[in-house]
């Protein structure tokens, strides 16, 4: 008894496909081709077993609500159109809906609308205030702000990490040691070696220190102060100790002596 899809129906049900987020209202419109004197208009949902479950009805100028009061039928002023709404749609409201009408005697007639599909999707923004729903989630703007701040913090941390790595790999550069010696005659370790500039440090023996100075730990540039130490005559050879008092008679550097920056 399955009849083919009919090209014309006195009842229309639109939209054919409707998607709403959970918590929002879902509204279909059922429209009659004309307005008979006496009729009953029903709103149905198709069950998984292809049975119709009546949700609500309109009869004799009155609404007949179904068991679930979330399903509402409203007659519009033109008399032909009816809004069929699900208040605060739930995920399990997804399914196939249709409306049907029976025009009562003397000429009893049944009409069914084409079917329409409702899809209720999970809520992604803030839940509506009108119905209970999942715990609130971050709004779009707030999410953007959090992501932005997080990105900046990660960037700063990466920058600090990079600085620390550079300080560990190139300790002289971070301590401010200058390159001395002739640029014209670079020392080479071998035929293929890159130019290497050497610097002889004089060791300062600060007499008021109670213990042997520890090797200076790599430190951030902003925590380092620099002084220019000038040695009279030729630069000290490795291992030579100079007393702190010898700094008092320091002379201005001669052109052949490159300036040496020492962390204090």
């Amino acid at each position: 008894l399955d009849s083919p899809d009919r090209p014309w129906s006195p009842l229309t049900f639109s939209p054919a496909q409707l998607t709403v987020q959970e918590g929002e209202n879902a509204t279909f419109t059922c429209s009659l081709a004309d307005i008979p004197d006496s009729f009953v208009l029903n709103w149905y949902r198709l069950s998984p077993r292809n049975q119709t479950d009546k949700l609500a009805a309109f009869q004799e100028d009155r609404i007949e609500p179904g068991r679930d009061r979330r399903f509402r039928v409203t007659r519009l002023p033109n008399g032909r159109d009816f809004h069929m709404s699900i208040v605060a749609a739930r995920l399990n409201d997804s399914g196939i809906y249709l409306c049907g009408a029976i025009y009562l005697p003397p000429n009893t007639q049944i009409n069914e609308s084409p079917r329409a599909e409702l899809s209720v999707t999970e809520r992604t923004l803030e839940p509506p205030t009108q119905s209970p729903s999942p715990p609130p989630r971050l709004s779009g703007q707030l999410q953007g702000l959090v992501i932005g701040v997080t990105s900046v913090l990660v960037g700063v941390l990466l920058l600090l990490l990079l600085t620390w790595v550079l300080a560990a790999v190139f300790p002289r550069a971070t301590r401010g040691a200058c390159v001395c010696g002739s640029e014209d005659e670079p020392l080479k370790e071998g035929p293929d070696a890159a130019p290497v500039f050497t610097l002889d440090y004089g060791e300062l023996d600060f007499q008021w220190r109670e213990k042997t100075p520890e090797p200076p730990a790599p430190c951030a540039p902003e925590q380092t102060e620099y002084a220019t130490i000038v040695f009279p005559g030729r630069p000290a050879s490795p291992g030579r100790r100079a007393s702190a008092s010898s700094l008092q008679g320091a002379q201005p550097p001669s052109p052949e002596d490159g300036p040496g920056l020492w962390p204090l």
Epitope: L1, D2, S3, P4, R6, W8, S9, P10, N42, Y44, L46, N50, Q51, T52, K54, L98, G100, I102, N107, T108, Q109, I110, N111, E112, S113, R115
Partner: nanobody, 120 residues
């Protein structure tokens, strides 16, 4: 042309139940809706229940709501009327009816009827 044959009528006590069947034959592909009417002695024929053939939308007269259930079985070309909590005023000849199209009426085709009697 569609032919309709009813069955399942009989005599029952108040509060009892009956199930009526209506088998359609012939050009059943054209059926759009089917239903049941009844006619008590000395009264006009009245609508009892109807069902849309494709969507399965169902309709009932106020007098039988909650007591009668209409259903259909496509495979058997059959429509059923399950009647429960029967009352004396339900006594009548029950007719099966078919509507041929959306523009037709539930009365394009009629069966011969089956008698239902409710008495103590």
């Amino acid at each position: 042309e569609v032919q309709l044959v009813e069955s399942g009528g009989g005599e029952v006590k108040p509060g009892g139940s009956l199930r009526l069947s209506c088998v359609a034959s012939g050009r059943t592909v054209s059926i759009y809706a089917m239903g049941w009417f009844r006619q008590a002695p000395g009264k006009e024929r009245e609508f009892v229940a109807g069902i849309g053939w494709n969507g399965g939308t169902t309709y009932y007269a106020d007098a039988v709501k909650g007591r009668f259930t209409i259903s259909r079985d496509h495979a058997k070309n059959t429509v059923y009327l399950q009647m429960s909590s029967l009352r004396a005023e339900d006594t009548a000849v029950y007719y099966c009816a078919a509507q041929e199209s959306a523009a037709g009426t539930l009365g394009d085709y009629w069966g011969q009827g089956t008698q239902v009697t409710v008495k103590p």
